[in-house]
Interface confidence: low
């Protein structure tokens, strides 16, 4: 099942621009905050650390002083700025700090640097699938499927809840798949017969959702008493 | 120069077994620490265990370290594997610098661990078709073993996607295959599993009604989306 804690952790920027990433460490007022980059297939590597006591940045050797900046805003909100972005800057950026002998990492922010001309709206487009009668009759359960298409970037989180409940329900999902220049993903939820008459919500977190809020796709309650016939023999 | 090598790019193991992840390192430091982290699919990086160069083998719950200082080897064993242990595991060498709080970690490339369901009697799947407009989904439930071929049968295919095969809460497998078809109403699904063929039509109910459950009368059947 999907974990939806924290903000959407992706930032998409065109080449040549700059990006700002916010640190989300659980440790407040750490003196030293480190920034790491992890790119697929490579080892995570430290880029720099920020010494808040002396308000200075210490770069790893080979790291350009013009490329990265970091500064503290209020509380534990440390900002990390990347300038003159190129596609090779894409990856997952983590802030980290030492806390009693172990290094704690933030939840990571995926930076996608792209030259592609994308549609104006690259938020996830939903399609809903309701349970088949066969499933509800044979198995006394029903599966809702939430299809999301034509979104960019590929970082997306999906979870399910009953209406009027904040409990996250156990769901399953496929891998995010590339379709032309955008992505698609689907998630499904199987519920027992007694829950089929409740409204369910597929909740989607994505960087390009309208107004930056979670998109809620409503799955209506369904009647399971339409059919009482037996299934075919098999 | 300091270096960390994780030679295994991926390993698979059934639940309840143990898996050992190897990590070799190079260092000239006289005293150091080695850390193991778990990276979730969400990219969250979680600290697991720490091994000091002058300490006995570290152990924490189901995680244990076999540390051989002379060989510069620090293997992590995860015992009694659970499905939630599926993740990428990173070994990292801690650099002792002027201040521990400024120390960097030197990471390996990571090892992906896939935890599979326990070996169990073969179970044939249930197959159901779900539709919305031109979209068709074939839902394949509760089968074992994992090997399966799912075919959406149609003469008017627009596009099809690779199936998603996941472990079900009961420790078997579930799968979904999606496609888009001009004649979605006539699409059926057939599945090859364990040298047998199973059809969605085998599970259809005898009725004149449509093959979908109905929303309650007061509900909208469209796909409302609040943003």
């Amino acid at each position: 099942s999907s974990n939806l804690e924290g903000r959407t952790k992706s930032v998409t920027r065109p080449t040549g621009s700059s990006a700002v990433i916010t640190c989300d460490l659980p440790v407040e007022n750490a003196v030293y905050t480190h920034w790491y980059l992890h790119q697929e297939g490579k080892a995570p590597q430290r880029l720099l650390y920020y010494d808040s006591y002396n308000s200075r940045v210490v770069l790893e050797s080979g790291i350009s002083r013009e490329k990265y900046h970091t500064y503290a805003s209020t509380g534990k909100s440390l900002k990390f700025i990347l300038e003159n972005l190129i596609e090779r800057d894409s990856g997952v950026y983590y802030c980290a700090t030492w806390d009693w002998g172990k290094k704690l990492f933030g939840s990571g922010t995926t930076l996608v640097v792209t030259d592609k001309q994308l549609d104006a709206d690259v938020s996830p487009k939903p399609t809903i699938f309701l349970p088949s009668i066969a499933e509800t009759k044979l198995q006394k359960a029903g599966t809702y499927l939430c299809l999301l298409e034509k979104f960019f970037p590929d970082v997306i989180k999906i979870h399910w809840q009953e209406k009027k409940s904040n409990t996250i329900l156990g769901s399953q999902e496929g891998n995010t798949m590339k379709t032309n220049d955008t992505y698609m993903k689907f998630s499904w939820l199987t519920v027992p017969e007694k829950s089929l008459d409740k409204e369910h919500r597929c909740i989607v977190r994505h960087e390009n959702n309208k107004n930056g809020v979670d998109q809620e796709i409503i799955f209506p309650p369904i009647k399971t008493d339409v059919i009482t016939m037996d299934p075919k023999d098999n | 120069a300091q270096k960390v090598t994780q030679a295994q790019s991926s390993v698979s193991m059934p639940v309840r077994k143990a898996v050992t992840l190897n990590c070799l390192y190079e260092t000239s430091w006289w005293s150091y620490y080695i850390f193991w982290y778990k990276q979730l699919p969400s990219k969250e990086m979680i600290f697991l265990i720490r091994q000091g160069s002058d300490e006995q083998n570290a152990k924490s719950g189901r995680y244990s370290v076999n540390f051989k200082k002379a060989a510069k080897s620090v293997a992590l064993t995860i015992s009694a594997l659970q499905l939630e242990d599926s993740a990428k595991y990173f070994c990292a060498l801690g650099e002792p610098n002027h201040f521990l709080n400024t120390d960097k970690l030197i990471f390996g490339k990571g090892t992906r661990v896939t935890v599979e369901p326990r070996s169990q009697p073969h179970t044939k799947p249930s197959v159901f078709v779900m539709k919305n407009g031109t979209n068709v989904a074939c839902l394949v439930k509760e089968f074992y073993p994992k090997d399966i071929r799912i075919n959406l049968v149609s003469s008017k295919k627009i596009t099809e996607f690779d199936p998603a095969i996941v472990i079900s809460p009961s420790g078997k497998y579930n799968a979904v295959k999606l496609g888009k078809y001009e004649d979605s109403n006539s699409v059926t699904c057939s599945v090859q599993h364990d040298n047998k063929t199973v059809h969605s039509t085998d599970f259809e109910v005898k009725t004149d009604s449509t093959d979908h459950v109905k929303p309650k009368e007061t509900e909208n059947t469209k796909q409302p989306s609040k943003s």
Partner: antibody, heavy 130, light 107 residues
Framework: EVQLVESGGGLVQPGGSLRLSCAAS????????IHWVRQAPGKGLEWVAS????????YYADSVKGRFTISADTSKNTAYLQMNSLRAEDTAVYYC???????????????????????WGQGTLVTVSS | DIQMTQSPSSLSASVGDRVTITCRAS??????VAWYQQKPGKAPKLLIY???SLYSGVPSRFSGSRSGTDFTLTISSLQPEDFATYYC?????????FGQGTKVEIK
């Protein structure tokens, strides 16, 4: 008031063992580190071992590694130095010391900066002789 | 290991004199250097930390400075209670190391 009191010193034969204690008051061992420093008669200061008891990090001088073990019991607010396989050259006054954290972020940042030693015990003499 | 080479090993001075003791680190130790004063039969006392910061309660006649890997302790006007042995210490890297000590005696 911060205080460190060592005990456990004495005369021991070569190859023998001793356990030194360092009882702390005025601060908690778990929120700091404790260090042992020794001084042979008429000689200079030599750092021996350090422990960061909240995490279990330990460090040793090469001259004692494998023979000495530093530990702490946070419930007793006491640090220990277990000395085995003692040699004549281990004869010294043994001091325990606490580091000085000079800036306000110390507790927030996890206390992992090394630091100079501002509080020392009175010392306990260990004599290794046959 | 970082060696701390302290000089002189001893010096004779009079009350009111300006006294300078130096310590050279074998490699960079940032500013993680401290100076201690020790009198016979007593534990060392912290005078200077972080190369140049005066520890609370220490008279202002004591000062510390750094130039690269050279560290200096200066007593601007020697007082009778200052006759003692002085040690430098680097604590920026394990193993922590001390200088050999400088004994300041009455001339």
């Amino acid at each position: 008031e911060v205080q460190l009191v060592e005990s456990g010193g004495g005369l021991v034969q070569p190859g023998g063992s001793l356990r030194l204690s360092c009882a702390a008051s005025g601060f908690t061992v778990s929120s700091s580190s404790i260090h042992w420093v020794r001084q042979a008669p008429g000689k200079g200061l030599e750092w021996v071992a350090s422990i960061y008891s909240s995490s279990g990090y330990t460090y040793y001088a090469d001259s004692v590694k494998g023979r000495f073990t530093i530990s702490a019991d946070t419930s007793k607010n006491t640090a220990y130095l277990q000395m085995n396989s003692l040699r004549a050259e281990d004869t010294a006054v043994y001091y325990c010391a606490r580091p000085y954290y000079w800036y306000p972020y110390y507790y927030w940042s996890g206390g992992w900066e090394y630091a100079a030693f501002d509080y020392w015990g009175q010392g306990t003499l260990v004599t290794v002789s046959s | 290991d970082i060696q701390m080479t302290q000089s002189p090993s001893s010096l004779s001075a009079s009350v009111g004199d300006r006294v300078t003791i130096t310590c050279r680190a074998s490699q960079s130790v940032s500013s993680a250097v401290a100076w201690y004063q020790q009198k016979p039969g007593k534990a060392p006392k912290l005078l200077i930390y972080s190369a140049s910061s005066l520890y609370s309660g220490v008279p202002s006649r004591f000062s510390g400075s750094r130039s690269g890997t050279d560290f200096t302790l200066t007593i601007s006007s020697l007082q009778p209670e200052d006759f003692a042995t002085y040690y430098c210490q680097q604590y920026g890297e394990y193993p922590i190391t001390f200088g050999q000590g400088t004994k300041v005696e009455i001339k």
